[in-house]
C-alpha cells in the first residue's frame, strides 16, 4: 500500500528489544512510517538510564530512524526507605529491588509497633507497595502504657517508684518552677495548662527531662519544646476548667523501658474510671514532710464521687467550680493525694482488656492542704479532650 518516493529509502527493519514489542509490524517502513515500542509489564522504556513513558520512531528521508531503539529494562524500585526505629529485610534476595521483589519492614520489638504486616512488593509503577496499596513506608509507632508497676502501693502517703514503673513521667523545669507531664507520643507531652501557661510564648526556656526516677539525677534524657499548645477554653487565673496543654518536642525521643508514652483512653475507658475505681499518680511534688520529693513517688488513689467532691469544694472555696471536665480522686479519710510540684502529671489507670496503662486525669488543683480528709485532688478529665488532643497532634 506504500508508494515509494524516489528520493527516500526504506528504513531498516526494527527489532524489538528484549522484553519489548513493536507496533505496528510492517513488511517495509518508508518515509514518515512510524513504530512504537511497548515493554512487558514490570519493564520500563529507557534511553540509557533516562526513563521514557512512550517511544515512537519515525522513518526519515535518508532511510534512517529518527531515534535509536530504547531498552526495556526491568523496573527497579531502588533501595527502600529507611524505617526509623525499625529495619527492612530483603526477602527475594540480598539487595534485590527489581519488579516483584519482596521486602519486609519490621519495628524494634517490644517498644515499637506497626499497624500493617510490613510486607511490600516492588510494583510496575516503580514504587514499593503494601498489600493495601500504600506507597509510603510503614511507621513504627511507639508502644504505649507498658509498666512494671502493679496496683497495690500504699507524693503524700506515697512510696518510691521503681525503674520502669512510670516511663511516661516527664519533669518540666522552668527557671524557678517545677511541674510534670506525661509522654503520650514520641514527640508530644501532655500536661496541665496552668503549669506551662507562663512559658507559652517562650517554650524554649522550658527544660524537659525524662527517663529518671531521682529528680536531680544527672542521667536524664533531655528534650526541648518546639511549641506549647494551651487549650483555648482555659483562662489563666479564673478557675481550672480545661486545664490541659500539649507540648510538641523538637525531636522524637527513643522509646525504651524507662521512656515510653502512656496510652490515651479508649472510648470504653470511662467505665474504668467510675467512683471507687483506683488510679495511680506519680510525681516529684511535696510529700507529707512538706518537701519536694527527691525520688519519684507514687500513690494509688480511688476516684471520688463527683457530687461529693463538688459539694466539698463549694463549701471550702465558694466560687471555685468542679466542672464536668474534671474528676476527683482521694480518700475521704485523707492521707493520699498529689500536691504542689506534681501538677501536669498523669493519673493513670490499668486497662484490663489491653493490659496497658492509660491517662485518665492530669494533676490540676486541689485544697492547699494536700491529703487532707474530705479534700480531694482534682484532675483534668482527659477522656473529654481526646478530639482536641488528636486534632492538635494531627495538625502540628
Amino acid at each position: 500500500h506504500h508508494h515509494h518516493h524516489h528520493a527516500s529509502r526504506p528504513c531498516p527493519d526494527p527489532t524489538a528489544p528484549p522484553n519489548g514489542s513493536i507496533s505496528p509490524v510492517q513488511a517495509i517502513y518508508v518515509l514518515k512510517d512510524r513504530f512504537s515500542v511497548f515493554c512487558k509489564t514490570g519493564f520500563e522504556l529507557l534511553q540509557g538510564s533516562v526513563p521514557l513513558k512512550s517511544f515512537t520512531a519515525v522513518c526519515q528521508k535518508d532511510g534512517s530512524w529518527d531515534r535509536p531503539m530504547p531498552e526495556c529494562s526491568i523496573i527497579d524500585c531502588g533501595p527502600p526507605d529507611d524505617l526509623p526505629n525499625g529495619h527492612v529485610d530483603y526477602i527475594t534476595g540480598p539487595e534485590v529491588t527489581t519488579y516483584k521483589a519482596v521486602i519486609q519492614y519490621s519495628c524494634e520489638e517490644t517498644f515499637y509497633t506497626m499497624s500493617s504486616n510490613g510486607k511490600y512488593v516492588c510494583e510496575a509503577d516503580g514504587f514499593w507497595t503494601s498489600s493495601k496499596g500504600e506507597k509510603l513506608p510503614p511507621v513504627c509507632e511507639p508502644v504505649c502504657g507498658l509498666s512494671t508497676h502493679t496496683i497495690g502501693g500504699r507524693i503524700v502517703g506515697g512510696q518510691p517508684a521503681k525503674p520502669g514503673d512510670f516511663p511516661w513521667q516527664v519533669l518540666l523545669l522552668g527557671q524557678t518552677t517545677a511541674a510534670a507531664g506525661a509522654l503520650i507520643h514520641d514527640n508530644w507531652v501532655l500536661t496541665a495548662a496552668h503549669a506551662v501557661y507562663e512559658k507559652r510564648m517562650a517554650a524554649s526556656s522550658l527544660n524537659i527531662r525524662m527517663g529518671i526516677l531521682k529528680r536531680l539525677s544527672p542521667h536524664y534524657t533531655q528534650a526541648w519544646p518546639e511549641e506549647i499548645f494551651i487549650h483555648e477554653g482555659y483562662t489563666h487565673g479564673a478557675g481550672f476548667d480545661n486545664d490541659i496543654a500539649l507540648i510538641k518536642l523538637k525531636n522524637k525521643v527513643t522509646i525504651n523501658g524507662s521512656i515510653m508514652p502512656v496510652c490515651l483512653p479508649r472510648k470504653e475507658a470511662a467505665s474504668l474510671m467510675r467512683t471507687d475505681f483506683t488510679g495511680t499518680v506519680a510525681g516529684w511534688g511535696l510529700t507529707q514532710k512538706g518537701l519536694l520529693a527527691r525520688n519519684l513517688m507514687f500513690v494509688d488513689i480511688p476516684i471520688a464521687d463527683h457530687q461529693k467532691c463538688t459539694a466539698v469544694y463549694e463549701k471550702l472555696y465558694p466560687g471555685v467550680r468542679v466542672s464536668a471536665n474534671m474528676l476527683c480522686a482521694g480518700l475521704e479519710t485523707g492521707g493520699k493525694d498529689s500536691c504542689r510540684g506534681d501538677a501536669g502529671g498523669a493519673l493513670v489507670f490499668l486497662d484490663n482488656e489491653t493490659q496497658r496503662w492509660f491517662v485518665g486525669g492530669i494533676v490540676s488543683w486541689g485544697s492547699i492542704n494536700c491529703g487532707a480528709a474530705d479534700q480531694y485532688g482534682v484532675y483534668t478529665k482527659v477522656i473529654n479532650y481526646i478530639p482536641w488532643i488528636e486534632n492538635i497532634i494531627s495538625n502540628f
Epitope: 534511553q47 540509557g48 538510564s49 526513563p51 513513558k53 509503577d125
Partner: antibody
Framework: DVQLQESGPGLVKPSQSLSLTCTVT?????????WNWIRQFSGDKLEWMGY???????SYNPSLKSRISITRDTSKNQFFLHLSSVTTEDTATYFC???????WGHGTTLTVSS | DSVMTQSQKFMSTSVGDRVSVTCKAS??????VAWFQQKPGQSPKGLIY???YRSSGVPDRFTGSGSGTDFTLTISNVQSEDLAEYFC?????????FGGGTKLEVK
C-alpha cells in the same frame, strides 16, 4: 513550544535550605520524560543533580543524596529542587532541563554567603 | 561513575575549517552520549543525542559519532557563530556525568 523557567531566592545563608522551582510550559511534566536539575559552577563545570520522571520516580546524584530532594506539583506543572545544609560550595547557576537536555531553562544564579 | 574526559580545554579554528571535539568515557556507555553548545551567558543547547542523532533545528554541519568509550563531535565548515564551549554528557547510567568542556575559538 516547550519552555522551562527556574526561580529561586538568589542568596542563601550557609547551613540553610534551598528551594528552587522550575515552571514548565508547552508540555506536561506527567506526559513523558525525566525532568532534571543541573548546576554549573563558576569554572563552567556542569553537575547533574537528579531528576524526577513523568511517573514521579526520582534519581539523585549519590554525591548529594543525603541533602537533595526533587518533588513536583502536577497541577501547576512545576518541579522543585530542595537542597539542605547548603555551603559556599553550592554557589552556582542552577538549570532545569528535560530528558537528556533537549530543552533547558535560562538558569538561576544562587549565592551562598553569610 | 562514568568519568567523561574532554582532553582539549581549548581549540582554535578558522571559519570554513572542519574541527573535531573529542570525549572519552571511563566505562562503556554504549551510544548514550549527548553534545551541547554553550555560548557565554546562555544555557547549554542540545546538539546531538544518542551519539549521532542531530537534535531538531541543529545545522547539519554538526555531526556526532562514536560508541562505547570514544566519542567525537565534528563541525564541518565552521561559522563564526560556532564560537562557544562544547560539552559531552553520558546518560547511560546514573549519575549522569558531563565532560569538562572544550572552548572553541574562531580565528
Amino acid at each position: 513550544d516547550v519552555q522551562l523557567q527556574e526561580s529561586g531566592p538568589g542568596l542563601v545563608k550557609p547551613s540553610q535550605s534551598l528551594s528552587l522551582t522550575c515552571t514548565v510550559t508547552g508540555y506536561s511534566i506527567t506526559s513523558d520524560y525525566a525532568w532534571n536539575w543541573i548546576r554549573q559552577f563558576s569554572g563552567d563545570k556542569l553537575e547533574w543533580m537528579g531528576y524526577i520522571s513523568y511517573s514521579g520516580s526520582t534519581s539523585y546524584n549519590p554525591s548529594l543524596k543525603s541533602r537533595i530532594s526533587i518533588t513536583r506539583d502536577t497541577s501547576k506543572n512545576q518541579f522543585f529542587l530542595h537542597l539542605s545544609s547548603v555551603t559556599t560550595e553550592d554557589t552556582a547557576t542552577y538549570f532545569c532541563a528535560r530528558y537528556w537536555g533537549d530543552y533547558w531553562g535560562h538558569g538561576t544564579t544562587l549565592t551562598v554567603s553569610s | 561513575d562514568s568519568v567523561m574526559t574532554q582532553s582539549q580545554k581549548f581549540m582554535s579554528t578558522s571559519v570554513g575549517d572542519r574541527v573535531s571535539v573529542t570525549c572519552k568515557a571511563s566505562h562503556n556507555v554504549g551510544t548514550n552520549v549527548a553534545w551541547f553548545q554553550q555560548k557565554p551567558g546562555q544555557s547549554p543547547k542540545g546538539l546531538i543525542y544518542s551519539a549521532s542523532y542531530r537534535s531538531s533545528g541543529v545545522p547539519d554541519r554538526f555531526t556526532g559519532s562514536g560508541s562505547g568509550t570514544d566519542f567525537t563531535l565534528t563541525i564541518s565548515n565552521v561559522q563564526s557563530e560556532d564560537l562557544a564551549e562544547y560539552f559531552c554528557l553520558q546518560y547511560n547510567s546514573n549519575p549522569l556525568t558531563f565532560g569538562g568542556g572544550t572552548k572553541l575559538e574562531v580565528k
